[in-house]
């Protein structure tokens, strides 16, 4: 029983070290709170899961709304 518990803890530790898993590995949702007040011109690029570079998260949110899409952020910085 104790061995099984240690094994499970070890497995969980390994999973947490290996980073995001499952659906999260596809990307994260853009934070859209700024978009409600209009996007700024600040250049803080993100790479979308569509392979396009967006100048900032707000612009990605804007396009998701206008195009009724669900593009996620696969990484910070340009694609």
């Amino acid at each position: 029983m104790k061995v099984t518990g240690i094994f499970l803890l070890s497995a969980l530790a390994l999973l947490s070290l290996s980073g995001n898993t499952g659906a999260d590995s596809l990307g994260r949702e853009a934070k859209c709170y700024n978009e409600l007040n209009g996007c700024t011109k600040i250049y803080d690029p993100v790479c979308g899961t569509d392979g396009n570079t967006y100048p900032n998260e707000c612009v990605l949110c804007f396009e998701n709304r206008k195009r009724q899409t669900s593009i996620l952020i696969q990484k910070s910085g340009p694609c």
């Epitope: 209009g38 569509d50 570079t53 100048p55 396009e63 206008k66």
Partner: antibody, heavy 117, light 110 residues
């Protein structure tokens, strides 16, 4: 900040229309550009947009025969519309779609396109 | 399909009077609604955005209100220069849309 359409002119039915919108005072790499038209005696009609990402959207009626492209280096956006008919006779406008206000501003002066045999 | 319906199609108003134009969206568009003034031979002019925010340089005699599906543009103290066609436009989405603009309202000033 301003936008201006290239000269329109007289076209024949089935011809392909190519119009260019030249922008100044802002960058295409961080702005949305839209095309809108107005037929004689009719209202404003949205044609399509090209987004910051390069993605495009078109009105459902325009989708099958319209293409919007851009050249960020030349600060130009091009509208190509195929299979023209007399119903495409209109003044064509390009406009910046302002992401901060969610509105078309500024607009170009417009250019008249006439389709007639 | 986010259709925009404007009423009336045409309205006559005396100088100094008040005119009210209504715009109805077929689906909820929040406050993503703009108003434009368009005169023959000119480029359209942005009057109002986000339903009630006055665009730069626009007279405070123009007032926008509403949210969701029902919107109104009111022009008070109408002047001859206000004779034009006014359009509403939804900015919520372009997906599956025929036209983002309403059909327009012609304002005739007596």
């Amino acid at each position: 900040q301003s936008v201006k359409e290239s000269e329109g002119g007289l076209f024949k039915p089935t011809d392909t229309l190519t119009l260019t919108c030249t922008v100044s005072g802002f960058s295409l790499s961080s702005n949305v550009i839209s095309w809108v038209r107005q037929a004689p005696g009719k209202g404003l009609e949205w044609i399509g947009d090209i987004y910051v990402s390069g993605n495009t959207d078109y009105a459902s009626w325009a989708k099958s025969r319209s293409t919007i492209t851009r050249n960020a280096n030349l600060n130009t956006v091009t509208l190509k519309m195929t299979s023209l008919t007399a119903a495409d006779t209109a003044t064509y406008f390009c406009a910046r779609y302002d992401m901060s206000s969610d509105a078309f501003d500024p607009w170009g002066p417009g250019t008249l396109v006439t389709v007639s045999s | 399909a986010y259709d925009m319906t404007q009423t009336p199609a045409s309205v006559e108003v005396a100088v100094g009077g008040t005119v009210t134009i209504k715009c109805q969206a077929s689906q909820n568009i929040g406050s993503y609604l703009s108003w434009y003034q368009h005169k023959p031979g000119q480029r359209p002019r942005l009057l109002m955005y986000r339903a009630s925010t006055l665009a730069s340089g626009v007279s405070s005699r123009f007032k926008g209100s509403g949210s969701g599906t029902e919107f109104t543009l009111t022009i008070s103290g109408v002047q001859c220069d206000n004779a034009a066609t006014y359009y509403c436009q939804q900015g919520y989405t372009n997906s599956g849309v025929d036209n983002t603009f309403g059909g327009g309202t012609e304002v005739v000033v007596k």
